[in-house]
């Protein structure tokens, strides 16, 4: 017989020879990192037809790392379903807990023993320190010193000393989230007041107000014979300016050689070049002005 078969988990005892006589026996042992569990044979004989009798390494089992329990408030998940060396054990924590230590352990071979690459991690409760205090405002639960996962606080602004109220800029409610950090930055309380929006040859058609505070929204239309250059809708933003800027109403050119004017500013505009009679602020007698504006 020629050289005996080789296996993943089993190796020949002694040196292999190039040829073996009929009836000659060779013995195998489990390789390093594997251990033998009877009854399967670990030897073979050179048969008279010059082939080796059947043998397998199925009696050799990988060394196994010790079983690790789920961490308290978490879970250990075997990546490939067994504890044999080469296995990966992934750790995750339940919602509201965070991992202290390595999130993956590897089953490794040290000499002939399979051991885990480190200590199992712990799952600790997510806690947040109190959220930031803000000028001209306050948050709920200001007396609490430690917040648990998903505990929420709500910010509100103080009454303003002057005629204009403080506006809350940002998220009014924030919660204790992953990484023991708050879900959003603390908001800001400040007076936000936009100027009265004046449009020559046009007028405001919605969003009327005594004063225009944060997020106030105003819409305009132009007089007959004028078209809107800019957006018909503007919003009072946190820096006390209108965004987009207050539009202008420009005179519609009646000269046939001139191109119909189109808006150069960002914001709603016709998606086609309407005839002069279809400009915003230049409606047909039987329809409202806003029918000719994009929403």
């Amino acid at each position: 017989c020629e050289a005996p078969p080789t296996f993943e988990a089993m190796e020949l005892i002694g040196k292999p020879k190039p040829y073996y006589r009929v009836g000659e026996r060779v013995d195998y042992k489990c390789k390093k990192g594997y251990f033998y569990i009877p009854p399967l044979a670990t030897h073979t004989i050179c048969d008279r037809n010059h082939t080796w009798l059947p043998v397998s390494d199925e009696g050799c089992y990988r060394e196994m790392c010790p079983h690790i329990r789920d961490p308290l408030n978490g879970e250990a998940i075997l990546a490939n379903g067994s504890y044999e060396f080469g296995a990966e054990l992934h750790f995750i924590c339940n919602e509201g807990y965070y991992l202290i230590g390595k999130d993956i352990l590897y089953c490794e071979l040290k000499d002939t023993v399979a051991i885990w690459s480190g200590k199992p991690p712990l799952c600790e409760k997510i806690l947040c320190t109190p959220p930031p205090k803000i000028k001209n405002g306050k948050h709920t639960f200001s007396e609490v010193e430690v917040f648990e996962y998903l505990d929420a606080v709500t910010y509100s602004c103080d009454p303003a000393p002057g005629p204009d109220p403080f506006s809350l800029i940002g998220e009014s409610m924030i919660y204790c989230g992953n990484n023991s950090t708050w879900s959003h930055a603390a908001p800001e309380c400040k007076v936000v007041k936009c100027r009265f929006p004046v449009v020559e040859n046009g007028k405001q058609i919605s969003g009327f107000g005594k004063k225009f505070y944060y997020k106030a929204t105003v819409m305009f239309e132009c007089d007959k014979g004028y078209y809107l250059n800019g957006s018909d809708k503007i919003v009072c933003e946190s820096n006390s300016t209108w965004d987009p800027p207050v539009p202008k109403c420009l005179k519609v050119s009646t000269s046939p050689t001139t191109k119909s004017p189109t808006s150069s500013a960002s914001g709603p505009r016709p998606t086609y070049k309407p005839p002069v009679s279809n400009y915003p602020g230049y409606p047909k007698p039987d329809e409202g002005i806003l029918n000719n504006l994009d929403d």
Epitope: R195, F196, V198, V199, E200, N201, K203, Q204, F208
Partner: antibody, heavy 118, light 107 residues
Framework: EVQLVESGGGLVQPGGSLRLSCAAS????????ISWIRQSPSRGLEWLGV???????NYNSAFMSRFTISRDDSKNTAYLQMNSLKTEDTAVYYC????????????WGQGTLVTVSS | AIQLTQSPSSLSASVGDRVTITCRAS??????LNWYLQKPGQSPQLLIY???SLHEGVPDRFSGSGSGTDFTLKISRVEAEDVGVYYC?????????FGQGTKVEIK
């Protein structure tokens, strides 16, 4: 609190020109929106125009061709330039601080009288 | 331009009377209406802005109401110091315009 004082009024012949001044004390004229308003027995109160803090202007179209509003920040003064004056322009002229960017007039000066007569 | 028409053009009241002045706009102006009082020999002074908001320092016997085209200024109990000419002013649209005035006298 800023005080606005009008000056430059007087007698002028029809067709003539006059420049009214509005001097600010206790504050910067460029920090406020300044409107000009006039009052006469025959025509009542008439808003003429405004110069905004950013230097932009809006006018009453009835006077746009003859009246111009400007500002000189170095002199801390706003101006109303009136050309081609007519007898019906005879009135007391007020410069007025627009209330905090809103078109209501809470800060009236004493005004300056302009008489257009030959 | 938007026209504002005040009525009556003049009225005479006794101290303590309730006085009502109306202002009608030639087109809808939402609540963008102010009221002024010009006392004899003085410049006008702001009484009410945005239809019903009292300007600082104005006594609460003054009140304003209305919306759209019809507006009212009321003095609940008129006093001697309330004499003068009352003006309304709109600011929804340029040019900002004033009413012709209502003269209030005390009997």
């Amino acid at each position: 609190e800023v005080q606005l004082v009008e000056s430059g009024g007087g007698l002028v012949q029809p067709g003539g020109s006059l420049r009214l001044s509005c001097a600010a004390s206790g504050g910067s004229v460029s920090s406020y929106d300044i409107s000009w308003i006039r009052q006469s027995p025959s025509r009542g109160l008439e808003w003429l125009g405004v110069i905004w803090t950013d230097g932009g202007t809006n006018y009453n179209s009835a006077f746009m061709s003859r009246f111009t509003i400007s500002r000189d920040d170095s002199k801390n003064t706003a101006y109303l330039q009136m050309n081609s004056l007519k007898t019906e322009d005879t009135a007391v002229y007020y410069c007025e601080r627009v209330y905090d960017g809103y078109p209501w007039f809470a800060y009236w000066g004493q005004g300056t009288l302009v008489t257009v007569s030959s | 331009a938007i026209q504002l028409t005040q009525s009556p053009s003049s009225l005479s009241a006794s101290v303590g009377d309730r006085v009502t002045i109306t202002c009608r706009a030639s087109q809808g102006i939402s609540n963008y209406l102010n009221w002024y009082l010009q006392k004899p020999g003085q410049s006008p002074q702001l009484l009410i802005y945005y239809t019903s908001s009292l300007h600082e320092g104005v006594p609460d016997r003054f009140s304003g109401s209305g919306s759209g085209t019809d507006f009212t200024l009321k003095i609940s109990r008129v006093e001697a110091e309330d004499v003068g000419v009352y003006y309304c002013q709109q600011y929804i649209k340029l040019p900002w315009t004033f009413g012709q005035g209502t003269k209030v006298e005390i009997k």
